[in-house]
Structures are given as C-alpha cells and as structure tokens.
C-alpha cells in the first residue's frame, strides 16, 4: 500500500508480486519525488484500493498504456 | 489468523426469508470483500453474490436477483445474506467466503450455515 | 457468462498414483484467474491454488495448478489418503459473476 506519512508526498517501499489484471484497474499514477526511496506506480483499482507497482515490470507497463489508450478514446 | 464465524442451522416454511450472518475477526474487515456461495444436498460449488464494503459495491448473480440481499456492518465486521421467498429448492449449506477484490480467489471460508425449507 | 467444465466426473485411483484433473472454460479466463478448491465431506472448501499456478499458503508441493486461456488443469503428483476428495476450479476475471465448475470426485479405487 502507499504510504502517505510525510504528506503530501507519498511514496511506495514495496510493490505487488502479483499481476492485476487490467479489467481491475481504475487509473494510475506516478511516483517520481526525490523524497522517496524508488520510484513507482500507483494502481488505483475498481474496488477503490491503491496499489504499489513496479514501473520496469512489464505487465505494469503494459498497463499504464491500456489506460493510456481508455483515456484517449472515450466510450460514447 | 482470518477467521469467519457463520449464524447457525435455520428451519424455514416456503414463501418465507432467511437471514444468514457472517462475523469476521483477525483481518481488516472493510478491505476485502465476502462472497456467498451456496451448496445444495449432494451438489457442487454455486456462487450467489459478494459485496466489498470498501468500494462500495454489492454484486448477485443474476438467477437470485431481486432475491437475495448482501449487507456489511463494518462497525461489527459482519456481513449478512437474506434470501428471500424460500423455495423447498433453496435448501442448502450457505457459506461465507473472503475475497480480495482486486482478485477473486476465495481465502477463506466460515463453517457453512444449513438452512432447510420445509413445510 | 463464463461456464466452467470439469472432467472427468470422477477420478478412481490408488494412493501414490498421479491425479490430473481438468478445467475447460467456454471463453479465455485472461491473466489466468483461476482457482482450486478440495472440499472434503462435511467440511468448507479449502482454497489450493490461485492465478492457476500459485499455490495457497500451507499447500503441499505435490499440488501444482497450471495452464492459460480456457484449459487449466490441476495435478497431485502422488496422491494420500487425505487427498480423496472433491476438487472444484472457479475463475474470478468476471466480476460478477465467479463460477465453479460442477467438480471432480477423486474416489479410492
């Protein structure tokens, strides 16, 4: 889970070992601050949990583009 | 340890409704989700509906739509099932069952509450 | 929805023998969410293995889940005495509904 305990920076100190299937995420966002440990993703899922990720994994990759491309073409 | 502690055995006359509690303890209740399943004499595995207090979101399969009622008290960490309109067919072990939301698989189980619909 | 077909319907076999049972789903379970379930007379499920291959916590290694897409199968490498008993797969991709197969009967011979 993230963790917010100097806000507003939040940061993540470890990630998920299992994949989340892209049907379970909401959106996404990225934790680049100097103020934390690495550097991370930040799933937000449809059951309205966060969850930390690693950016150089593929499947995480993989979807930030899926949810890249939802934004880019919104359903009618 | 999660642990899931069901109501006990229940009687009831067809046409009327039952209600089936489930205590949680030894985990984060509002983080996870409880689904229902529900096995009749001799039959497998049917999958009757979940709610996952966090989001929000109670979810039924569609043949007990508009029969069945999921609700979570999270103050107690229970959830509870209300079927109603019983039918002689709804006998049943009716179980309990914790899921994460993000994935489904069911973790772990409460001891099974028969109910049995008779005349 | 997805319908999950398990086969065989029963399973007769001897202790140390190796069990492979079998999942069919009748569209793709993508990113393989699926599970397996021993129930015993009398008792809860108990959950064996998640994502089709991850084995739950405590479960012996002679478990192993596998497979992707519509065909997953389970296997106990060397069956015990305490492993006769009824196996149920579910798949959880679809929210709503998760469903199980109708389950296999692993029977003493």
């Known amino acids: 889970q993230p963790d917010a305990i100097n806000a507003p920076v939040t940061c993540c100190y470890n990630f998920t070992n299992r994949k989340i299937s892209v049907q379970r995420l909401a959106s996404y966002r990225r934790i680049t601050s100097s103020k934390c440990p690495k550097e991370a993703v930040i799933f937000k899922t449809i059951v309205a949990k966060e969850i930390c990720a690693d950016p150089k994994q593929k499947w995480v990759q993989d979807s930030m583009d899926h949810l890249d491309k939802q934004i880019q073409t919104p359903k009618p | 340890q999660v642990e899931l502690v069901q109501s006990g055995a229940e009687v009831k006359k067809p046409g009327s409704s039952v209600k089936v509690s489930c205590k949680a303890s030894?985990?984060?209740?509002?983080?996870?989700?409880i689904s229902w399943v529900r096995q009749a004499p001799g039959q497998g595995l049917e999958w009757m509906g979940a709610?996952?207090?966090?989001?929000?979101?109670?979810h039924y399969a569609q043949k007990f739509q508009g029969r069945v009622t999921i609700t979570a008290d999270e103050s107690t960490s229970t959830a509870y099932m209300e079927l109603s309109s019983l039918r002689s067919e709804d006998t049943a072990v009716y179980y309990c069952?914790?899921?994460?939301?993000?994935?489904?698989?069911?973790?772990?189980w409460g001891q099974g509450t028969l109910v049995t619909v008779s005349s | 929805d997805i319908v999950l077909t398990q086969s065989p319907a029963t399973l007769s076999l001897s202790p140390g023998e190796r069990a492979t049972l079998s999942c069919r789903a009748s569209?793709?379970?993508?990113?393989?969410?699926l599970a397996w379930y021993q129930q015993k007379p009398g008792q809860a499920p108990r959950l064996l293995i998640y994502?089709?291959?991850s084995r739950a916590t405590g479960v012996p290694a002679r478990f192993s889940g596998s497979g992707s897409g519509t065909d997953f199968t389970l296997t106990i490498s060397s069956l015990e005495p305490e492993d006769f008993a009824v196996y149920y797969c579910?798949?959880?991709?679809?929210?709503?509904?998760?469903?199980f197969g109708q389950g296999t009967k692993v029977e003493i011979k």
């Open positions: 030894g985990g984060t209740f509002s983080s996870y989700g």
């Open positions: 579910q798949q959880y991709i679809t929210y709503p509904p998760f469903t």
């Open positions: 994502d089709a291959s």
């Open positions: 069952a914790r899921y994460d939301g993000i994935y489904g698989e069911l973790d772990f």
């Open positions: 569209q793709s379970v993508s990113d393989a969410y």
């Open positions: 709610i996952n207090p966090l989001a929000g979101h109670t």
